[in-house]
Interface confidence: low
C-alpha cells in the first residue's frame, strides 16, 4: 500500500492525461482524485502507464469503490482489467454485453484466465440469461467455453458456433451437454461429405442416438475405441454385433480390452453369444445360445 503523502504544489491532476506518466507512484496516489479517475477511465488505456503506476490507479479505485466498481467504470478499465483479481471481479455486477466484449478484448490472444472465467460467471449471473448474442460472443472468444454451460444454457447455442470447436474443447463436456450439442453439430455439418463429416462430428458423438450410429456403421468410418467408449450407453445397447463391427472396422479388436468397461460390458450382455463368437475375439458374457431374446417393447406388450 502506498504511503499517504501530500500532493506537491501545482501537481494536482485536473484531468487524466499523459503528463501523469511522469508522476512517481506516491505523486499519483497523492495528486490524482479517485472520482476524477473514475469519470475519465476511458483515457487511461491510451496512456502508457507502467505496471507500478497501474497498481496505484487500481488502489485508488478500490478505495473509492470498496463494494465493487460500477459498470460505468468497469467498461472502460482496459488494460487495468489485467490487474484485477477474481476476488475483485466477484464484487462486480456486469450486465452490458459491450462491457463484456471490451474486457474480453483486453484478454484477447490468451487462454481463459481465472479473471476472465470469473467475469463471465458474474456476467451470466448479472444478466440473468444467456441469449444468442451473449453465446456468440463467448464462443467466438473461447470455443471451449461451451462445456462450462449447463444443458439448459447450451440449448440456445447457435449451430454456427460449433464450427470453431476442436476435439479438446469438448474434453470436459459431460453426456448431458453432448446430448444438446450433438444435434447442433449434425445440423452445422450436414452438407459435408462422408469422410469430412465424420472427422468433424466424431467429437460430438457422445450425444448421438442409436439411429445415427446405425447410419454411421454403413459408411466405413472406422470409429476408434476411444470414441466408441464415449458413446451413450442407451445408444450402443440396441446395436447388433454386425453393426458394431462395421462401425469400428479394423478397431473392432479393441473391444476385447474394453469388455469389462461400460458401455461395452452392457452391450456384450445383450448380445447373443453365438453372434459375439463371430468376431473371433473371445468375448464372453453374451446371451447363451438357445435362449429366447425378446425385444424390450415386445416384452412390455406381453406383460
Amino acid at each position: 500500500e502506498v504511503e499517504k503523502t501530500a500532493c506537491p504544489s501545482g501537481k494536482k491532476a485536473r484531468e487524466i492525461d499523459e503528463s501523469l506518466i511522469f508522476y512517481k507512484k506516491w505523486e499519483l496516489e497523492a495528486c490524482v482524485d479517485a472520482a476524477l479517475l473514475a469519470t475519465q477511465m476511458d483515457r487511461v488505456n491510451a496512456i502508457p502507464f507502467t505496471y507500478e503506476q497501474l497498481d496505484v490507479l487500481k488502489h485508488k479505485l478500490d478505495e473509492l469503490y470498496p463494494q465493487g466498481y460500477p459498470e460505468s467504470v468497469i467498461q472502460h478499465l482496459g488494460y487495468l482489467f489485467l490487474k484485477m483479481s477474481p476476488e475483485d471481479i466477484r464484487k462486480w455486477n456486469v450486465t452490458s454485453l459491450e462491457t463484456l466484449k471490451a474486457l474480453l478484448e483486453v484478454n484477447k490472444g490468451h487462454e481463459m484466465s481465472p479473471q476472465v472465467a470469473t467475469l463471465i460467471d458474474r456476467f451470466v449471473k448479472g444478466r440473468g440469461q444467456l441469449d444468442k448474442d451473449t453465446l456468440d460472443t463467448l464462443t467466438a472468444f473461447y470455443p471451449g467455453y461451451l462445456c462450462s454451460l449447463s444443458p439448459e444454457e447450451l440449448s440456445s447455442v447457435p449451430p454456427s458456433s460449433i464450427w470453431a470447436v476442436r476435439p479438446q474443447d469438448l474434453d470436459t463436456c459431460d453426456p448431458r451437454q453432448l446430448d444438446v450439442l450433438y444435434p447442433k453439430a449434425r445440423l452445422a455439418f450436414q452438407n459435408m461429405n462422408g469422410s469430412e463429416y465424420f472427422v468433424k462430428i466424431q467429437s460430438f458423438l457422445g450425444g448421438a442416438p442409436t439411429e445415427d450410429l446405425k447410419a454411421l456403421s454403413q459408411q466405413n468410418v472406422s470409429m476408434d475405441l476411444a470414441t466408441f467408449m464415449k458413446l451413450r450407453t442407451d445408444a450402443v445397447l440396441p446395436l447388433t454385433v454386425a453393426e458394431v463391427q462395421k462401425l469400428l472396422g479394423p478397431h473392432v479388436e479393441g473391444l476385447k480390452a474394453e469388455e469389462r468397461h461400460r458401455p461395452v460390458r452392457d452391450w456384450i450382455l445383450r448380445q447373443r453369444q453365438d453372434d459375439l463368437d463371430t468376431l473371433g475375439l473371445g468375448l464372453q458374457g453374451g446371451i447363451p445360445n438357445g435362449y429366447l431374446v425378446l425385444d424390450l417393447s415386445m416384452q412390455e406388450a406381453l406383460s
Partner: antibody, heavy 120, light 107 residues
Framework: QVQLQESGPGLVKPSQTLSLTCTVS??????????WSWIRQPPGKGLEWIGY???????YYNPSLKSRVTISVDTSKNQFSLKLSSVTAADTAVYYC????????????WGQGTMVTVSS | DIQMTQSPSSLSASVGDRVTITCRAS??????LNWYQQKPGKAPKLLIY???SLQSGVPSRFSGSGSGTDFTLTISSLQPEDFATYYC?????????FGGGTKVEIK
C-alpha cells in the same frame, strides 16, 4: 485465390525479439473457418508448429516456446503477427505462416516462407 | 505432447514404383492426420487430410489410410515430380506436431 505473405527482418541479433507479419490476400482473416498458424523449419531439419490464432484472438502456443511467443491478429489489416523473444542461434529457421482449415484440420495454404538468421 | 514417428526416414525408389510411408502417433488421434509434400526451397503442400481425404488438385496416385495411431501414405506409381520429402502431421491435439519426415530419392 487466398495467398499468404510473410514479411520481417531476415537478421536478428541474439537476445532480441524476432518479429514477423503474415499478410492474407484474396480472403478475409475474419472467416470463422480457419486458424492462422506460424510454423518454422531450421535448416536441414523438420517442421515445428509454433502456434495459431483464431480471428477472435484466441491462441494456442507450442509449450516448448510458449514463454517466448506472442501471436496477434489485426483483422483491419488482414494480418497476423509473430513475436519471438530472447532469440538464440537455435531459432534460426525458415518461418512459414499457414492457414489451417477448421473443417479439414489441415494446413491447406502456406506462405512461401522467410529465412530468419539469428546472429550477432 | 503427441509424438509422430515416421518411417523410413529416407528411401530410394524408381519412377513407376509403389511407395509406402508410415506414420505412427504416440496416442490415438482418431482421423486427424495429414500428409504434406515439400520440395527444396519451397513451402510444404497439403496432399491428404483427415487421414484419407485427397486435397483438391492433388493427383489420385496419392492415397492415405489409417485411423487411431497408425497411418499410411501410398504413392501408387511414383512420378519424377514426386521426389521430395513427405511429412505427416496430427491436428487432434495441441501442440500440433509433425513427423520427422521421409525423403524420397531417385534410385
Amino acid at each position: 485465390q487466398v495467398q499468404l505473405q510473410e514479411s520481417g527482418p531476415g537478421l536478428v541479433k541474439p537476445s532480441q525479439t524476432l518479429s514477423l507479419t503474415c499478410t492474407v490476400s484474396g480472403g478475409s482473416i475474419s472467416s470463422g473457418d480457419y486458424y492462422w498458424s506460424w510454423i518454422r523449419q531450421p535448416p536441414g531439419k523438420g517442421l515445428e508448429w509454433i502456434g495459431y490464432i483464431y480471428y477472435s484472438g484466441s491462441t494456442y502456443y507450442n509449450p516448448s516456446l510458449k514463454s517466448r511467443v506472442t501471436i496477434s491478429v489485426d483483422t483491419s489489416k488482414n494480418q497476423f503477427s509473430l513475436k519471438l523473444s530472447s532469440v538464440t542461434a537455435a531459432d534460426t529457421a525458415v518461418y512459414y505462416c499457414a492457414r489451417e482449415d477448421v473443417v479439414k484440420g489441415a494446413f491447406d495454404i502456406w506462405g512461401q516462407g522467410t529465412m530468419v538468421t539469428v546472429s550477432s | 505432447d503427441i509424438q509422430m514417428t515416421q518411417s523410413p526416414s529416407s528411401l530410394s525408389a524408381s519412377v513407376g514404383d509403389r511407395v509406402t510411408i508410415t506414420c505412427r502417433a504416440s496416442q490415438s488421434i482418431s482421423s486427424y492426420l495429414n500428409w504434406y509434400q515439400q520440395k527444396p526451397g519451397k513451402a510444404p503442400k497439403l496432399l491428404i487430410y483427415a487421414a484419407s481425404s485427397l486435397q483438391s488438385g492433388v493427383p489420385s496416385r496419392f492415397s492415405g489410410s489409417g485411423s487411431g495411431t497408425d497411418f499410411t501414405l501410398t504413392i501408387s506409381s511414383l512420378q519424377p515430380e514426386d521426389f521430395a520429402t513427405y511429412y505427416c502431421q496430427q491436428s487432434y491435439s495441441t501442440p500440433l506436431t509433425f513427423g520427422g519426415g521421409t525423403k524420397v530419392e531417385i534410385k
